[in-house]
């Protein structure tokens, strides 16, 4: 937001000759310089094996500010979260590169059914204090059935959100042991206030 | 910006009903048009083979003006690279579709190790002056292993960057000749100031 | 839009310790409040087999305000179109979850040809009325060759492109029975006004 | 199980501070929101706020901005509440829940009593 | 702050009987959450989201509504039902709850 001692103030006119209007008649509209919203882009880390729940996707922890890294303008990150500081619609993105190794999906199929193939899936997730539960924002979600090789591939998703003050932003993965944690610019995560 | 012989000039108030502050107190917001931006969307035309050094990805080059291609706002594109005329935080995104024919790599296993199968990787770079090596912003990458058939897929990458006047972008892939570059719908590249 | 009974009246002057330029001096500069512009995100609902025309993909209906979907800022949404109220340059989204089962592209190729691979495709597409074809924007084309399996993959777009107040956007689908309509968060649309 | 474990019974004098505590086990805290509500004897369900563990981010219901204050440790999963200046008219049971994340567990509950 | 009035204050009932009780909200709220209270517990989440079944809740238990009114329904009163309800809204800050509804043994 625009901080001084007190507010931008925007004068309207009905008429583009006229001379400015009385100072009662000003609209304080809400404008804001665009350097000053809530912005974060973080890359990929190493992951620690953490403790996550049954029927939980674990969650990715980032890099807030080494290399390309970085949050802006009261966007915080910590502890896996994203922190919304301020109501507005956001544009919410993320990239995992995943690498692995199948060998055993191409297999003859037993009794005529086809194998339920290996996946990979990933989920932007919000939690919010205003609902009793995590709201899943964007998923991507794909069948892995490679032949006889080490395999990688990224998921890109990204979406815009009406997000409130308090929200927390998370990156949720199938299987966090698949995910390449190697560069930068394989694997992130950022949200930007529009 | 707003551009005009000086600069937008937004006054603030500390009290929303007195009249305009004396204008030693203006503040100078750095608020601007929209429009104003600079912005640019490129599209994919046929790639003439070119050198390109061992151990580096050639660069696409782009249609800047036909279709719907366009720059504006000071982006400029000239010789494989937008060009960023202003610092700030920008968006930047690609797709490059990818088509080709495999037909080895779900063959036995030689000596109990998989191949090391085919891939496809996109690459969004920054050169910056001041620095002199160029980074890699984004990477798209997939290992490509059909069962022995004409293949075809696109690698999507869009990101936030902070960059600086001056910088440039340019878009590099693992393989040119394996770029489709029949439709300005299925590859491109863009970038906008937000 | 600032909208009041004229216009956002911002003053330009050539030495920051000026007076206030006269009012005939006065640029009106196209400034308006973020919050104000023209969004959507729509979501995925179950699709009614419609009968579309041969050689033209069909096109995909969306759920505009349960869940995570949201219109705002006159951007409407009516009978498959996501209608555009203001002229600009708009960042336009979507991705698309197919899910199917293929068995028979790894068969034997005959006559030394490769089989020609099932595929799945989504275009974001711009109706105009002053132009009598459409315009495709986006295209995601992907070939489909998995061995003997339950598959599924996301298709993901985005970009930004100029357009005019009237315009209309919508998405295609090679196969409307191949997407996946369960959640809300895989199968997706958007767009909005920067 | 999921679970939250509150501290027990306390008895204060007006004037007298009182922190209570709520363990979590079987989900991360960081992960969810933790709120406090207060239910006077024979009265209903009144929200006091709710602190965010993963920032320490808090939100008061204002007619309890003053003498209340949410803290947590995540290390030991634990929310606390504490109240200042106590009056006889914060006799009560002050439960802690969740959300964010289901199944909503609500703690046991611990009765507070100010009396001279 | 949002005022949520419930009604009726006190709901005699029979087990087997259809009963539905009322929240009203003093301005317009996204969702409502509605709570059961057994003396001496801690309240337990019935209903989410204005109509979503919390975990474990049984499916006679239903809510509606949108706006300012809601309601929620017990199709067939059990006798384990014989509790306080109680509404809250989580759109404003701060969180309200409505003042209860006791549902007793007729």
């Known amino acids: 937001q625009l901080r001084a001692q007190g507010e931008a103030c925007v004068q309207f006119q009905a008429l583009k000759g006229q001379e400015f209007a009385p100072s009662h008649q000003q609209v304080y509209a809400p404008l804001r310089a665009d350097g000053d919203k809530p912005r974060a882009h973080l890359t990929v880390v190493r992951q620690t094996p953490t403790q996550h729940f049954k029927n939980q996707f674990p969650a990715l922890h980032w890099e807030h500010e080494l290399g390309l890294a970085f949050t802006k303008n009261r966007m915080n990150y910590t502890n896996k979260f994203l922190l919304i500081p301020e109501s507005g619609d956001y544009f919410i993105y993320s990239q995992v590169t995943f690498r692995g190794m199948t060998s055993e999906c191409s297999e003859i199929r037993q009794a005529g059914r086809p194998n339920k193939p290996d996946s990979i899936t990933v989920v932007i997730t919000k939690v919010t204090d205003s609902y009793p539960e995590p709201t899943q924002l964007l998923m991507g979600t794909k069948s892995v059935c490679e032949v006889g090789s080490n395999w990688f591939q990224p998921i890109y998703l990204g979406a815009m959100f009406s997000l409130q003050e308090g929200d927390k932003l998370m990156v949720n993965v199938s299987d966090i042991s698949l995910v390449d944690y190697t560069k930068e610019d394989k694997t992130f995560f950022g949200a930007f206030l529009l | 910006q707003l551009r005009a012989q000086g600069e937008a000039c937004v006054q603030f108030q500390a009290l929303k009903g007195q009249e305009f502050a004396p204008s030693h107190q203006q503040v100078y917001a750095p608020l601007r048009a929209d429009g104003d931006k600079p912005r640019a969307h490129l599209t994919v035309v046929r790639q003439t083979p070119t050198q390109h050094f061992k151990n580096q990805f050639p660069a696409l080059h782009w249609e800047h003006e036909l279709g719907l291609a366009f720059t504006k706002n000071r982006m400029n594109y000239t010789n494989k690279f937008l060009l960023i005329p202003e610092s700030g935080d920008y968006f930047i995104y690609s797709q490059v579709t990818f088509r080709g024919m495999t037909s080895e790599c779900s063959e036995i296993r030689q000596a109990g190790r998989p191949n090391k199968p085919d891939s496809i990787t996109v690459v969004i770079t920054k050169v910056t002056d001041s620095y002199p090596e160029p980074t890699q912003l984004l990477m798209g990458t997939k290992s490509v292993c059909e069962v022995g058939s004409n293949w075809f897929q696109p690698i999507y990458l869009g990101a936030m960057f902070s960059l600086q006047e001056g910088d440039k972008l340019m878009v590099n892939v693992s393989d040119i000749s394996l770029v489709d570059y029949t439709k300005e719908d299925k590859t491109f590249f863009g970038a906008f100031l937000l | 839009q600032l909208r009041a009974q004229g216009e956002a009246c911002v003053q330009f002057q050539a030495l920051k310790g000026q007076e206030f330029a006269p009012s005939h001096q006065q640029v009106y500069a196209p400034l308006r409040a973020d919050g104000d512009k023209p969004r959507a995100h729509l979501t995925v609902v179950r699709q009614t087999p419609t009968q579309h025309f041969k050689n033209q993909f069909p096109a995909l209906h969306w759920e505009h305000e349960l869940g995570l979907a949201f219109t705002k800022n006159r951007m409407n949404y009516t009978n498959k179109f996501l209608l555009i109220p203001e002229s600009g340059d708009y960042f336009i989204y979507s991705q698309v979850t197919f899910r199917g089962m293929t068995s028979e592209c790894s068969e034997i190729r005959q006559a030394g040809r490769p089989n020609k691979p099932d595929s799945i495709t989504v275009v974001i597409t711009k109706v105009t009325d002053s132009y009598p074809e459409p315009t495709q924007l986006l295209m995601g084309t992907k070939s489909v060759c998995e061995v003997g399996s339950n598959w599924f993959q996301p298709i993901y777009l985005g970009a930004m492109f100029s357009l005019q107040e009237g315009d209309k956007l919508m998405v295609n689908v090679s196969d409307i029975s191949l997407v996946d309509y369960t959640k809300e968060d895989k199968t997706f649309f958007g767009a909005f006004l920067l | 199980q999921v679970q939250l474990v509150q501290s027990g019974a306390e008895v204060k004098k007006p004037g007298a501070s009182v922190k209570v505590s709520c363990k979590a086990s079987?989900?991360?805290?960081?992960?969810?929101?933790m709120h406090w509500v207060k239910q006077a004897p024979g009265q209903g369900l009144e929200w006091m706020g709710r602190i965010d563990p993963a920032s320490g981010h808090t939100k008061y219901d204002p007619k309890f901005q003053v003498r209340a204050t949410m803290t947590t440790d995540t290390s030991t999963s634990t929310a606390y509440l504490e109240l200042s200046s106590l009056r006889s008219e914060d006799t009560a049971v002050y439960y802690c829940?969740?959300?964010?994340?289901?199944?909503?567990?609500w703690g046991q509950g611990t009765t507070v009593t100010v009396s001279s | 702050e949002i005022v949520l009035t419930q009604s009726p204050g006190t709901l005699s009932a029979s087990p087997g009987e259809r009963v539905t009780m009322s929240c009203r909200a003093s301005?317009?709220?996204?969702?409502m959450y509605w709570y059961q209270q057994k003396p001496g517990q801690a309240p337990r989440l019935l209903i989410y989201?204005?109509?979503n079944l919390a975990s474990g809740v049984p499916d006679r238990f239903s809510g509606s509504g949108s706006g300012t009114d809601f309601t929620l329904t017990i199709s067939r009163v059990e006798p384990e039902d014989f509790a306080v309800y109680y509404c809250q809204q989580w759109s404003g800050n701060p969180r309200t709850f409505g003042g209860g509804t006791k549902l007793e043994i007729k």
């Open positions: 079987g989900f991360d805290i960081c992960d969810t929101y």
């Open positions: 301005s317009s709220v996204s969702y």
């Open positions: 989201a204005t109509s």
């Open positions: 829940s969740r959300s964010g994340g289901l199944p909503d567990v």
